[in-house]
Interface confidence: medium
């Protein structure tokens, strides 16, 4: 048996786990949370390179979630919408990890308190959290073979040369998508 994620040793700063976050909630098709290269977040029926995640404790009970293949952080807008960002914004990209007795975990935005859900069939800006918190089962992935890439947490300068028609370049959050029409 691997050390369960409920181990108190895993709740303190610097602890790194590689996991697939699997959900089998009744209202959801069975899926693994996946952070794609272009910043979209979705669910994959099977484990995929994009669904292998690195969970790193920032402080007790609070983690950041990084897509191992895509080097994008899982982040959440105030309306509950999920996206993958090349930049780590502590407010948007920190999640409180709540451990359930059955081995499942619940994640919620530390800043907004909104529960983490895979994108459903409704646009998140209209229906950000229609259900209770989604339960995720952290399935073991490969142990990290290499240290984190240097500077992964260092914010990159915003893309000032881009006149992005989607207004996706934020002043302090890197490229987070704008859902406001």
């Amino acid at each position: 048996h691997p050390i369960p994620d409920s181990s108190p040793l895993l709740q303190f700063g610097g602890q790194v786990r590689q996991r697939y976050l699997y959900t089998d909630d009744a209202q959801q098709t069975e899926a693994h949370l996946e952070i794609r290269e272009d910043g979209t977040v979705g669910g994959a029926a099977d484990q995929s390179p994009e669904s292998l995640l690195q969970l790193k404790a920032l402080k007790p009970g609070v983690i950041q979630i990084l897509g191992v293949k895509t080097s994008r952080f899982l982040c959440q807008r105030p309306d509950g919408a999920l996206y993958g960002s090349l930049h780590f914004d502590p407010e948007a990209c920190s999640f409180r990890e709540l451990l359930l007795e059955d081995g499942y975990n619940v994640y919620q935005s530390e800043a907004h308190g909104l529960p983490l859900h895979l994108p459903g069939n409704k646009s998140p800006h209209r229906d950000p959290a229609p259900r209770g918190p989604a339960r995720f089962l952290p399935l073991p992935g490969l142990p990290p073979a290499l240290p984190e890439p240097p500077g992964i947490l260092a914010p990159q300068p915003p893309d000032v040369g881009s006149s992005d028609p989607l207004s996706m370049v934020g002043p302090s959050q890197g490229r987070s998508p704008s859902y406001a029409s």
Epitope: R36, E37, D38, G39, T40, G42, K69, T70, S71, Y83, L86, P119, G120, N121, S123, H125, R126, Q156, D159, G161, S162, S163, D164, P165, L166, M168, R175, P177, Y179, S181
Partner: antibody, heavy 117, light 106 residues
Framework: QVQLQQSGAELARPGASVKLSCKAS????????ISWVKQRTGQGLEWIGE????????YYNEKFKGKATLTADKSSSTAYMELRSLTSEDSAVYFC??????????WGQGTTLTVSS | QIVLTQSPALMSASPGERVTMTCSAG?????MYWYQQKPRSSPKPWIY???NLASGVPARFSGSGSGTSYSLTISSMEAEDAATYYC?????????FGGGTKVEIK
């Protein structure tokens, strides 16, 4: 401003290969994906595949595996698509497009490929 | 792969008329994206994340839907809106486009 400048029209023989280019400017090339989209005359749009220059990771539509190969040169901010074993079915306009958050937000002007003997 | 079916394939509308076209997905998708294309031109980004207008798109356009049913509406048709509109999804690989709805002006 963001621009995707594609190479000029190509005329090729059946069985030959051709390499189309897409030069990006006005944004950080490695922060976005470049997709390629096919459009035959009077037809709809078909996604071929996508490359992420930052990682060189590529994703293909199964239909085009073995037909198309996507590459990118970070130093020149240019994406390439090589099409091999050309047939008349490959005659089309090919667009490169920038990919961001699931959306194709900028498009090149298109390259017309004609395959004829 | 997820098949997107657009209807109607061709429609004609008078100036000022309300126009609605639909995009039906073979299985549920999270979001829909729309593009406008005119003859001999590249497609233009039109609507993203189901209901958000891309930069420069007139407010008379709107998008809605969820699950397997999505639509694009022009509240008051204008001559410049004559074009072909394509829907696109990426909830599942490969990314797929609908066959397009061609809108003509009467």
């Amino acid at each position: 401003q963001v621009q995707l400048q594609q190479s000029g029209a190509e005329l090729a023989r059946p069985g030959a290969s051709v390499k189309l280019s897409c030069k990006a400017s006005g944004y950080t090339f490695t922060n976005y994906g470049i997709s390629w989209v096919k459009q035959r005359t009077g037809q709809g749009l078909e996604w071929i595949g996508e490359i992420y220059p930052r990682s060189d990771n590529t994703y293909y539509n199964e239909k085009f595996k073995g037909k198309a190969t996507l590459t990118a040169d970070k130093s020149s901010s240019t994406a390439y698509m090589e099409l091999r074993s050309l047939t008349s079915e490959d005659s089309a306009v090919y667009f490169c497009t920038r990919s961001d958050y699931g959306f194709f937000d900028y498009w090149g002007q298109g390259t017309t490929l004609t395959v004829s003997s | 792969q997820i098949v997107l079916t657009q209807s109607p394939a061709l429609m004609s509308a008078s100036p000022g008329e309300r126009v609605t076209m639909t995009c039906s997905a073979g299985s549920s998708v999270s979001y829909m994206y729309w593009y406008q294309q005119k003859p001999r031109s590249s497609p233009k980004p039109w609507i993203y994340l189901t209901s958000n207008l891309a930069s420069g798109v007139p407010a008379r356009f709107s998008g809605s839907g969820s699950g397997t049913s999505y639509s694009l509406t022009i509240s008051s048709m204008e001559a410049e809106d004559a074009a072909t509109y394509y829907c696109q999804q990426w909830s599942s690989n490969p990314r797929t486009f609908g066959g397009g709805t061609k809108v003509e002006i009467k």
